[in-house]
Amino acid sequence: MAVTACQGLGFVVSLIGIAGIIAATCMDQWSTQDLYNNPVTAVFNYQGLWRSCVRESSGFTECRGYFTLLGLPAMLQAVRALMIVGIVLGAIGLLVSIFALKCIRIGSMEDSAKANMTLTSGIMFIVSGLCAIAGVSVFANMLVTNFWMSTANMYTGMGGMVQTVQTRYTFGAALFVGWVAGGLTLIGGVMMCIACRGLAPEETNYKAVSYHASGHSVAYKPGGFKASTGFGSNTKNKKIYDGGARTEDEVQSYPSKHDYV
């Protein structure tokens, strides 16, 4: 029962995590304009992995896709790749784990097969979570580096007369969604791996064989060193890790100037 609960919970936590990774990858707020030095700006800039957006004083938001592939920074490409790999691995892991769930009967699938599938999906979830955490962390590091670089030369003189503030970017909501989602996927994967240990048959149960030694009538029962045969109640203490976190994405999109009715 504990194994089923651990496996089920691992699946649900991973499912939430992967949904979060997908959401984070699609979100536009990976980096948002730092308002510390310009809190009164009427033009607010924010950027995602796929496009950059500007919200104007009218409330209108315009987003432009990065239509170039070669012109993009290598780090951004790496982050995209990590997030996509994370999503793909997570999706495959979810597919595998559905068939591995103890509560779902598929033909005459043995527990050993389910255990292997649970372990496979668990590893996939762990790698998926790590990919997401790595991707988000790489992007965050890129932001921090750029932030301090732009702080160093924030004011660029215009003919020595007028100063213009260079736009600096700070952490956007997508980074926090990504970190939490990656963490949940990782926790879900660990739970699946723990569940796998409970699903796997821990010994081969031999039928008792009587060996008749001359002059003696003693029956030897090999394999008696294990307390549990796998059929009785499982007395082992299995920890169930519960990762409960909520993420919220409040993105408001606006119609274009020509979207008036």
């Epitope: 800039n45 209108f60 213009t164 119609p255």
Partner: antibody, heavy 115, light 113 residues
Framework: QVQLVQSGAEVKKPGASVKVSCKAS????????IHWVKQAPGQGLEWIGY????????NYNLKFKDRATMTSDTSISTAYMELSRLRSDDTAVYFC????????WGQGTLVTVSS | DIVMTQSPDSLAVSLGERATINCKSS????????????LIWYQQKPGQPPKLLIY???TRDSGVPDRFSGSGSGTDFTLTISSLQAEDVAVYYC?????????FGGGTKLEIK
């Protein structure tokens, strides 16, 4: 088509308050900020502030912050601007405006402050 | 606050001639996020609300005749009417759309010579 229809002219005494309305139609009211602009007789334009009907957020020109209050009622697609403690120099035409680059303006509401 | 300074205060141009109105801001209106300048030009005729001509310094609003054009970047901007028509007689305003409080120029009164 997009329309902003403002309330009629008002005559008020110094110290009183006035509430000007701006009814929007032809677009999704909650999608755009509604800005308010003052134009004193024979003078230029002065931005008062805006209300964001989508989330109720607002931003005021510090000059008007302590006397101007902007609200909106999304159920009837109407924005309001209330100006309290009126003075004679508040006599002006008040416009509401919206859209990208303030593409759409109300016809204006003349507020006369006179004792 | 960003101060918008328009010049000249008034301008008289012959019909069919070019009219040029200048606008200078005390701070740059350039947004590096999308490489655009956030300056707006309006036309206002007596008894009417202002009418949008140009936004983002050079983007003409729909329905605005192509004789109206906007140019400039950073702090210096220009509105040009390539061939003045009788219906262009009005007061023209520039506006900072980059930083709160949004501020307007003092206006330029355009007349026919």
């Amino acid at each position: 088509q997009v329309q902003l229809v403002q309330s009629g002219a008002e005559v008020k005494k110094p110290g009183a308050s006035v509430k000007v309305s701006c009814k929007a139609s032809g677009f999704t009211f909650t999608s755009y900020n509604i800005h308010w602009v003052k134009q004193a007789p024979g003078q230029g334009l002065e931005w008062i502030g805006y209300i964001s009907p989508g989330n109720g957020g607002s931003n005021y020109n510090l000059k008007f912050k302590d006397r101007a209050t902007m609200t909106s009622d999304t159920s009837i697609s109407t924005a309001y601007m209330e100006l309290s403690r009126l003075r004679s120099d508040d006599t002006a035409v008040y416009f509401c405006a919206t859209g990208r680059g303030f593409a759409y303006w109300g016809q204006g509401t003349l507020v006369t402050v006179s004792s | 606050d960003i101060v918008m300074t328009q010049s000249p205060d008034s301008l008289a141009v012959s019909l069919g001639e070019r009219a040029t109105i200048n606008c200078k801001s005390s701070q740059s209106l350039f947004n590096s996020g999308n490489q655009k300048n956030y300056l707006i030009w309006y036309q206002q005729k007596p008894g009417q609300p202002p009418k949008l001509l140009i936004y983002r310094a050079s983007t003409r609003d729909s329905g605005v005749p192509d004789r109206f054009s906007g140019s400039g970047s950073g702090t210096d901007f220009t509105l040009t009417i390539s061939s003045l028509q009788a219906e262009d007689v009005a007061v023209y305003y520039c506006q900072n759309d980059y930083s709160y409080p949004l501020t307007f120029g003092g206006g330029t009164k355009l007349e026919i010579k």
